[in-house]
Interface confidence: low
């Protein structure tokens, strides 16, 4: 049998084979050693017995899509049946105190390969033998600890294969410079050591994509925006657009990248070399956001011009013969670059929202019958922008970290957006008060520290920062979410 008989049905064309040469990979026309590495068709009953205690699942992932010329990395992780794991020696053991449907196992080993390899004979001093080879007969590389690697992974794509000895997780990187654009299929077959042979335990395939477009994604965030994922934002507040380029192999690390923005609101084109930009929409409505990313990326060099005709007789050379076997014009310039582009488009909706909230006055409410240890405090609050429909106060310790009390209630506010919020404080001391006004699309927060005095008629309430605002600067990027009466801070990055 040949590798292509064993590893997959997809047969690439001769053109594909010729134009998709992967560095370090071998042609799947090579012979496969079926005696050492038996081949089972899909549905063969022997698959059921290939692993003790269940089936092993191979999970193949890649960091696709890959920009042509960059490296794409494939990772295969083996998922063992419940209660099984690989130990430091590469043996498969039952997890301690893990109960599967068979109950607790007395034998700690599922597979004790250390014992197998220690008593295996017929090897010379190098540890090399007829069975320490890959399916094509190449010997295993003797990395330190290679004996603890009990799985053989065979990767197959584009008419070529790559063999790797490993543990329960392996990683393989492939340069995509010679790979045809578009979706391609990677198939992996995994074998486990079984005495002096190998047994197939899993097969997995995954589609990966090679593209000439830079993969681009944009995150959008805005202070006071209640839901950053719904692409609805607030008028008159800056939106931060952050461009994420999917470049896991850092192919574009040394490229100059330009970002060309059109915000769809007749503000024209905005060109930047910074991946983050702020933009404020001053009108309500729906706008089409467009981004074009341009990078000068390493790329194939144009074919060299044809060499000049050879002179009829030899010319004196500057150095010994053979120093420069190529004519100067034929020496490739390895630093050729090609412009690559990426595009992103989104439709965003701009609406009114609560832009700002301030506590302008704090007043201790004199109670006719004061509670034993309780103070009522009124906060006079103003806001700008749309009219809030709810107010939440979170009372916490002076560090603003440990919530002591949280209350939300609907509010009915006039056009002037002036309201009074009354809250009770148990006991004297310093408190952090987070006050949030919200409507359907926005949340605006202000914070202040207040000092509640003892219930002494002579004492009076002090606000740490008179005039309101309090810790507003610290908290302005903070988002408050509430569900019933359980409240937590969520930092909104």
């Amino acid at each position: 049998k040949r590798f292509h008989d064993v590893l997959g049905n997809e047969r690439p064309s001769a053109y594909m084979r010729e134009h998709n040469q992967l560095n370090g990979w071998s042609s799947d026309e090579n012979d496969w050693n079926e005696k050492l590495y038996p081949v089972w068709k899909r549905g063969d009953m022997r698959w059921k017995n290939s692993w003790k205690g269940g089936r092993v699942q191979a999970v193949l992932t890649s960091d696709s899509p890959a920009l042509v010329g960059s490296n794409i990395t494939f990772v295969v992780n083996l998922v063992f049946p419940r209660c099984q794991k690989e130990d430091a020696n590469g043996n498969i053991v039952y997890e301690k105190n893990c109960r599967n449907e068979a109950g607790l196992s007395a034998d700690p080993y599922v597979y004790n390969w250390t014992a197998w390899s220690e008593d295996s004979d017929g090897e010379n001093g190098t540890g090399q033998s007829h069975h320490n080879v890959f399916p094509d007969g190449k010997p295993f590389p003797h990395h330190p600890g290679w004996r603890r690697w009990n799985f053989v992974y065979v990767f197959h794509t584009l008419g070529q294969y790559f063999q790797k000895l490993g543990r329960c997780s392996v990683r393989v990187s492939v340069n995509t410079a010679n790979v045809t654009l578009g979706p391609q299929l990677m198939e992996v077959t995994v074998y486990r050591r079984h005495g002096r042979a190998y047994v197939p335990i899993a097969q997995v395939k995954d589609v990966y994509v090679v593209t000439d477009q830079i993969p681009v994604f944009v995150t959008m965030s805005q202070k006071n925006d209640r839901n950053s994922s719904d692409e609805t934002f607030l008028k008159d507040l800056p939106i931060t657009f952050d461009v994420l380029i999917h470049d896991p192999s850092h192919f574009l690390n040394y490229s100059t990248i330009n970002y060309k923005w059109s915000f769809g609101d007749n503000t024209g084109l905005f060109v930047s070399i910074n991946h983050t930009v702020n933009h404020t929409y001053v009108l309500n409505g729906t706008f089409s956001l467009n981004l074009t990313v341009k990078a000068a990326a390493p790329g194939p060099c144009p074919p060299p011009p044809p060499p000049p005709p050879r002179p009829p007789k030899p010319t004196p050379s500057l150095g010994p013969a053979g120093d420069n076997p190529l004519g100067l014009s034929e020496i490739p310039d390895e630093n050729c670059q090609i412009n690559r582009y990426g595009h992103f488009q989104a439709t965003i909706t701009i609406v009114e929202g609560i832009l700002e909230v301030n506590i302008i006055q704090t007043t201790d409410v004199l109670m006719l019958v004061p509670g034993p240890d309780s103070s009522l405090i009124d906060f006079v609050v103003t806001c700008q922008g749309s009219i809030p429909t709810e107010v939440c106060t979170i009372i916490s310790d002076p560090t603003c970290e440990i919530t002591q009390n949280a209350v939300c209630s609907p509010v009915d506010v006039d056009e002037m957006c002036l309201l009074t919020v009354r809250r009770a404080f148990n006991g004297s001391g310093t408190y952090c008060v987070n006050l949030t006004l919200g409507d359907d699309t926005s949340l605006a927060l202000t914070s202040t520290l207040i000092s509640v005095p003892d219930r002494d008629p002579a004492s009076s309430l002090r606000m740490a920062n008179s005039g309101g605002g309090g810790l507003n600067d610290i908290f302005e990027a903070q988002k408050i979410e509430w569900h019933e009466h359980h409240h937590h801070h969520h930092h909104h990055h």
């Epitope: 009953m45 059921k48 017995n49 290939s50 692993w51 003790k52 205690g53 269940g54 089936r55 049946p81 449907e101 068979a102 109950g103 196992s105 007395a106 034998d107």
Partner: antibody, heavy 120, light 107 residues
Amino acid sequence: QLQLQQSGTEVVKPGASVKIPCKASGYAFSSYWMNWVKQRPGKGLEWIGQIYPGDGDTNDNGKFEGKATLTVDKSSNTAYIQLSSLTSEDSAVYFCARSPLHLRGSMDYWGQGTSVTVSS
Amino acid sequence: SIVMTQTPKFLLVSAGDRVTITCKASQSVSNDVAWFQQKPGQSPELLIYSASNRYTGVPDRFTGSGYGTDFTFTISTVQAEDLAVYFCQQNYYSPFTFGGGTRLEIK
């Protein structure tokens, strides 16, 4: 050809023990679980336990603890169940049945059964 | 241990009829349910494993379905040779347990 060969009938006295063989052929004995199932006349099926010949790992029904012991002899590809302190409640047909590793309870091939009669 | 409640206990049908047997597990057993056929005087035979997979060589008139606690076994067109007792069995939790059986008789 795949076979699980069991002895036909065993008649034993109350309080005695009996060891029932199940000889496997035609498949990789060490790579399948061997199960034992009890069936009393006109009654349903009761799973006693299973053993993995490859390493002797067992998985037992606690109800039969002290009653049934499962063993294997890999050299002869034979699994055994030993029933001890027999009473009339133990009179039944005992089947051996193999199951694949990852479907350890899906018994895909059964012996013809051994009838045990406990009688004085 | 898991109790498998199998209904009905008895079925009297004519050849060509469609037959459905149900099994209810006392708690979820995922899809780890098998169905067996036991003809008079014979050993049980595996028909369905993993709730819905037909075992090799089993005619396609036998089907299984279900997940969690409720499982169904169907014979789409009963034939004379289907006279037997049918058992469900869960093999998710040890000890593995069988239903009480359904005796199928042909008119």
